[in-house]
């Protein structure tokens, strides 16, 4: 077999098929893969952001001067391997995933920076980076050990419109409460003072400067 040093888990992922059940994986272990093995490195663990975005670097040890490379992200969960996304790129050019792909990426030499978006808690799993050197021949295949991506769904936030209504209601309530309070206070003050009451202002003589107490004009009611 040409793929010397090809590990067991690599053999089970050699075909670019969308979903492989457990039985097919078992069967593929016994199919010889006639290609050269290539080392692929990727981080062991990555935690997705609260927005469901996970990024990791996939690095491959290119044995030759590849001009065309194909990168595939596979997800392994519950003994099933699913193709998440794939992109073929010419060396020196940008990675181009399909328009509806959840993946984006950039390449730099033998490194591919992959970003997977729209992840949810149910998408937690082992994400495997598969690299194929498509041209020139011979064909080389490398499959990483996988990156365990953990996705934690954020606490469900109330609807923004609902929040707006609550804010409006509270504000209105406070406004009417303060208005009512003011009205009540004014009415009490007015009740204490009879509208027929008359009085005079008596201006008291000014105090000495050294005197600390200051007298202000005050209201004297006249019966």
């Amino acid at each position: 077999m040409a793929c010397l040093g090809f590990q067991r888990h690599k053999a089970q992922l050699n075909l670019a098929t969308r979903t492989w059940p457990c039985t097919l994986l078992f069967f593929l272990l016994f199919i010889p893969v006639f290609c050269k093995a290539m080392h692929v490195a990727q981080p062991a663990v990555v935690l997705a952001s609260s927005r469901g975005i996970a990024s990791f670097v996939c690095e491959y040890a290119s044995p030759g001067k590849a001009t065309e490379v194909r990168v595939t992200v596979l997800r392994q969960a519950d003994s099933q391997v699913t193709e998440v996304c794939a992109a073929t790129y010419m060396m020196g050019n940008e990675l181009t995933f399909l328009d509806d792909s959840i993946c984006t990426g950039t390449s730099s030499g033998n490194q591919v920076n992959l970003t997977i978006q729209g992840l949810r808690a149910m998408d937690t799993g082992l994400y495997i980076c598969k690299v194929e050197l498509m041209y020139p021949p011979p064909y080389y295949l490398g499959i990483g050990n996988g990156t365990q991506i953990y996705v934690i769904d954020p606490e469900p936030c109330p609807d923004s419109d609902f929040l707006l209504w609550i804010l409006a209601a509270v504000s209105s309530g406070l406004f009417f409460y303060s208005f009512l309070l003011t009205a009540v206070s004014l009415s009490k003050m007015l009740k204490k003072r009879s509208p027929l009451t008359t009085g005079v202002y008596v201006k008291m003589p000014p105090t000495e400067p050294e005197c600390e107490k200051q007298f202000q004009p005050y209201f004297i009611p006249i019966n």
Partner: antibody
């Protein structure tokens, strides 16, 4: 059963262009596991690789023919085509379309071939 | 470009004979070699790939060996239906090139 069928063969004038199509049946040309290619064989001579194409449109050509060759794919019709420009008598051959697996650069399925004669 | 040279260019053998065809590469090509059979007026058929792996459906009397620059295709017991021209093809680098062919006939 996978079948490949070439069409468009016949007589082409020197300096003109030959255009051949290969229709794939019994399988999808959009399979990510295969490449599709053209090989030719001049009468009584050996085989010569012309080029390959992937369903996404990526192409590889024989450097000796690269300046004159264009291979294209039409996934909606499940077919791929060959255009060879500025033909001479040396381009007279049976043209085969074929399939190869991604992992291998050998051809496991071949069409029946179509003869192209370059003559005035 | 790497040149592929086949020998002999033609041979004649009796039914049941062991037949050996050689293919030599001008540079080492590891085991990136395939063998094809083309019967008169027919389409080439893949027999062996990766120098020694038999394509499914190919009779076990066909076998391939070799690595680097020297390769052989062996027909352990020649049958009348084996009358054909055999081509080797290297695929370690671009361009893919074929050998000149070896024509096998029955005595």
């Amino acid at each position: 059963q996978l079948q490949l069928q070439e069409s468009g063969g016949g007589v082409v004038r020197p300096g003109g262009s030959l255009r051949l199509s290969c229709t794939v049946s019994g399988g999808s040309i959009s399979s990510s596991s295969y490449y599709w290619g053209w090989i030719r064989q001049p009468p009584g001579k050996g085989l010569e690789w012309i080029g390959n194409i992937y369903y996404s449109g990526n192409t590889y050509y024989n450097p000796s023919l690269k300046s004159r060759v264009t291979i294209s794919v039409d996934t909606s019709k499940n077919q791929f085509s060959l255009k060879l420009s500025s033909v001479t008598a040396a381009d007279t051959a049976v043209y085969y379309c074929a399939r190869r697996r991604i992992q291998l650069w050998s051809f496991d399925y071949w069409g029946q071939g179509t003869l192209v004669t370059v003559s005035s | 470009d790497i040149q592929m040279t086949q020998s002999p260019s033609s041979l004649s053998a009796s039914v049941g004979d062991r037949v050996t065809i050689t293919c030599r590469a001008s540079q080492g090509i590891s085991n990136y070699l395939a063998w094809y059979q083309q019967k008169p007026g027919k389409v080439p058929k893949l027999l062996i790939y990766a120098a020694s792996t038999l394509q499914s459906g190919v009779p076990s009397r066909f076998s391939g060996s070799g690595s680097g620059t020297d390769f052989t295709l062996t027909i352990s017991s020649l049958q009348p239906e084996d009358v054909a021209t055999y081509y080797c093809q290297k695929y370690n680098s671009a361009p893919l090139t074929f050998g000149g062919g070896t024509k096998v006939e029955i005595k």
